[in-house]
């Protein structure tokens, strides 16, 4: 899989994360920090 | 299957304002980004801003700084382009379209007329 | 905001031609670049994105190149069904379109 960093267009998207562009899936990823998950990294869990 | 289902055709007068809006099904508009795009007849496509549903916020091309309004009803699932002080050259099909968890899927786009 | 300066703004070619089309961003967009197909009476279709990134069910005969500010999408064989307009987009800095390319048959 070809991945590269999000575009600036994308700033803010990961909440608590890192936003990874997925180039042959045509799709934004948030990889989160630890103690979040959801799509954009937006839930905090213990 | 995911989809982005728009409003119905407008016609409206010089002067007043248009709201349109875009329902998302099979997907949370909150993952995403809805960008908005319209295309006057004849002409290319023009993108006029976004917004991002989770936060609320919003960026817009400067020239419809002050006459758009893009706002998210994230309980309903929900995206909606305000354009106010329409003039003719406003007439155009207005499109929604998702950005973030895939990459640019288009609704099927809204006709609006100005016309006296 | 970054402009997309696309041309030619239309041209005519012979089925099995190779036709190119060129995108100039008027600073580096790093390769975030899309090609959208538009046929009349519909929504832009998707052909490729991140440069060359050609969406599944698009034929091989579509592509795109570039870096920086320069970006191409090429047709290495027209074929009757291509007739349309094409425009490129770039989204590295929110998003703005070329001023589109029509496609005809000569």
């Known amino acids: 899989v070809s991945i590269t960093k999000c575009s600036s267009d994308m700033n803010g998207y990961c909440l608590h994360g890192q936003c990874i562009y997925l180039v042959d899936m045509s799709q934004n990823y948030c990889r989160c920090e630890v103690g979040y998950t959801g799509v954009r990294c937006e839930h905090f869990f213990l | 299957q995911d989809q982005l289902v728009q409003s119905g055709a407008e016609v409206k007068k010089p002067g007043a304002s248009v709201k349109v809006s875009c329902k998302a099904s099979?997907?949370?508009?909150?993952?995403?980004?809805i960008q908005w795009v319209r295309q006057a007849p004849g002409q290319g496509l023009e993108w006029m801003g976004r917004?991002?549903?989770?936060?609320?916020?919003?960026k817009y091309r400067e020239k419809f700084e002050g006459r758009v309004t893009i706002t998210a009803d994230t309980s309903t699932n929900t995206a909606y382009m305000e354009l106010s002080s329409l003039r003719s050259e406003d007439t155009a099909v207005y499109y929604c379209?998702?950005?973030?968890?895939?990459?640019?899927?288009w609704g099927q786009g809204t006709l609006v007329t100005v016309s006296s | 905001r970054i402009q997309m300066t696309q041309s030619p703004s239309s041209l005519s070619a012979s089925v099995g031609d190779r036709v190119t089309i060129t995108c100039k961003a008027s600073?580096?967009?790093?390769?975030?670049i899309a090609w959208y197909q538009q046929k009349p009476g519909q929504a832009p279709r998707l052909l490729i994105q991140?440069?060359?990134t050609l969406q599944p069910g698009v034929p091989s005969r579509f592509s795109g190149s570039g870096s920086g500010t320069d970006y191409t999408f090429t047709i290495s064989s027209l074929q009757p069904e291509d007739i349309a307009t094409y425009y490129c987009?770039?989204?590295?800095?929110?998003?703005?379109f070329g001023g589109g390319t029509k496609v005809e048959i000569k």
């Open positions: 379209v998702r950005s973030g968890t895939l990459f640019d899927f």
């Open positions: 099979g997907f949370n508009i909150k993952d995403t980004y």
């Open positions: 917004i991002d549903p989770l936060r609320g916020n919003t």
């Open positions: 600073q580096d967009i790093h390769k975030y």
């Open positions: 991140y440069t060359s």
């Open positions: 987009l770039q989204y590295d800095n929110l998003r703005t």
